[in-house]
């Protein structure tokens, strides 16, 4: 998956740091104090639609087959720059009962971006 | 996640059957002959951006915090109707060496759609 470098406007991964204090979560998230969540941005021209980061998922490959053949309704589907690979991260926080929990939270960090 | 019922144009899951014969894959996929891949379509107005089916992923919850506050650069990010939950499926196929393989292939079936 492409890293955004300011030179291209094609779908890429942009670095972004989330501060839990900024969003008011620091009173229940013990650690970390923030993290690099990242996000996806950029254009998805038709020739790269269905390219999910470095590798295609089976589903997007199949749908792209139909899309590239102008098969209705896929020809008109908007292709979007979205996370295609997310990574978990370990967090220490208070749960709803104020117990301290250490848990690997799924889908916290965007690793790769691609065109849906 | 919403199922498309023809009544709403909000992001929803559309039923779609893929025939491997149609896309010319029947010469290497032994079974099944096709499957319900489904796909996502529909609008993502700002008030539902970041709502991934029935529950938010941690990443989209965080980004939505910033987006809904009009925080640059998220305010201008295009929100898209994309798969938020995919399911694997078992397939029987020939590999490159013409060996018969039975494998659970990840991300084959769209289970839920949501706004990125």
């Amino acid at each position: 998956g492409l890293e955004c470098d300011g030179k291209v406007n094609i779908c890429c991964k942009k670095q972004f740091f989330v501060s839990f204090k900024d969003i008011g979560w620091n009173d229940w998230i013990i650690a970390p104090s923030g993290y690099h969540a990242n996000y996806c941005e950029g254009e998805c021209p038709s020739h790269i639609a269905g390219t999910s980061g470095s590798s295609l998922s089976f589903h997007s490959t199949v749908i792209n087959h139909y899309r590239m053949r102008g098969h209705s309704p896929f020809a008109n589907l908007k292709s979007c720059c979205v996370p295609t690979k997310l990574r978990p991260m370990s967090m220490l926080y208070y749960d709803d009962g104020q117990n301290i929990i250490k848990k690997d939270i799924q889908n916290m960090i965007v690793e790769e971006c691609g065109c849906s | 996640g919403l199922e498309c019922d023809g009544k709403v144009n909000i992001c929803c899951k559309k039923q779609f059957f893929v025939s491997f014969k149609d896309i010319g894959w029947n010469d290497w996929i032994i079974a099944p002959s096709g499957y319900h891949a489904n796909y996502c379509e529909g609008e993502c107005p700002s008030h539902i951006a970041g709502t991934s089916g029935s529950s938010l992923s941690f990443h989209s919850t965080v980004i939505n915090h910033y987006r809904m506050r009009g925080h640059s650069p998220f305010a201008n990010l295009k929100s898209c109707c994309v798969p938020t939950k995919l399911r694997p499926m078992s397939m029987l196929y020939y590999d490159d060496g013409q060996n018969i393989i039975k494998k659970d292939i990840q991300n084959m079936i769209v289970e839920e759609c949501g706004c990125s």
Partner: antibody, heavy 123, light 108 residues
Framework: QVQLVQSGAEVKKPGASVKVSCKAS????????MHWVRQAPGQGLEWMGS????????IYAQKFQGRVTMTRDTSISTAYMELSRLRSDDTAVYYC????????????????WGQGTLVTVSS | EIVLTQSPGTLSLSPGERATLSCRAS???????LAWYQQKPGQAPRLLIY???SRATGIPDRFSGSGSGTDFTLTISRLEPEDFAVYYC?????????FGGGTKVEIK
């Protein structure tokens, strides 16, 4: 300690509007969503909707769509629920309740509630 | 939406007895995002159980929650005089958030 203090009882005529406030203290106001739940006399609990105080993002129950407006003033840690076009069957106790709606972390129960505001709709 | 059905509507028991309250969901409540609340007359509801089985802060251990999927249970092992109240289950996995109709535990 966490406290949610609601405004006092109201008596309204049919067709009028009511605005109930919920002042939060003892925690970071914008870090938790605020939900509104009502309870008609002798009846069960009915969820009306919620607001994310950080972003202002709201989700309303379909039943109240178009009649309810949830807002907040982060400078005074207060959430508001306004219900318009009141009918007699809107007579109920209205509660605010806080929650962290983060399913990925297993969070979302209503851990603190306001004391309730009785709204009576009568001609 | 997920519809929650509580049974029985009323439970008449004596102090010291065991109370078993049921909550059934119209569809699976994924990852046990289910809570139980206690409400006494003239008071706001109070969180008892979250995540189907975890006790909230300050809740005595005579209260326990169990279940997954579509069937959930709140058990009060030995009823104390202060436990006579109405109990509600609630799901928080999807919008709209929904509550069960409640079970009233009254003194026999």
């Amino acid at each position: 300690q966490v406290q949610l203090v609601q405004s006092g009882a109201e008596v309204k005529k049919p067709g009028a509007s009511v605005k109930v406030s919920c002042k939060a203290s003892g925690y970071t106001f914008h870090g938790y969503n605020m939900h509104w739940v009502r309870q008609a006399p002798g009846q069960g609990l009915e969820w009306m909707g919620s607001i994310n105080p950080y972003s202002g993002y709201t989700i309303y129950a379909q039943k109240f769509q178009g009649r309810v407006t949830m807002t907040r003033d982060t400078s005074i840690s207060t959430a508001y629920m306004e219900l318009s076009r009141l009918r007699s069957d809107d007579t109920a106790v209205y509660y605010c309740a806080r929650a962290r709606d983060i399913a990925a972390a297993g969070l979302g129960a209503f851990d603190y509630w306001g004391q309730g505001t009785l709204v009576t709709v009568s001609s | 939406e997920i519809v929650l059905t509580q049974s029985p509507g009323t439970l008449s028991l004596s102090p010291g007895e065991r109370a078993t309250l049921s909550c059934r969901a119209s569809q699976s409540v994924r990852s046990s995002y289910l809570a139980w609340y206690q409400q006494k007359p003239g008071q706001a509801p109070r969180l008892l159980i979250y995540g189907a089985s975890s006790r909230a802060t300050g809740i005595p251990d005579r209260f326990s929650g169990s279940g997954s999927g579509t069937d959930f249970t709140l058990t009060i092992s030995r009823l104390e005089p202060e436990d006579f109240a109405v109990y509600y289950c609630q799901q928080y996995v999807s919008y709209p958030r929904t509550f069960g109709g409640g079970t009233k535990v009254e003194i026999k």
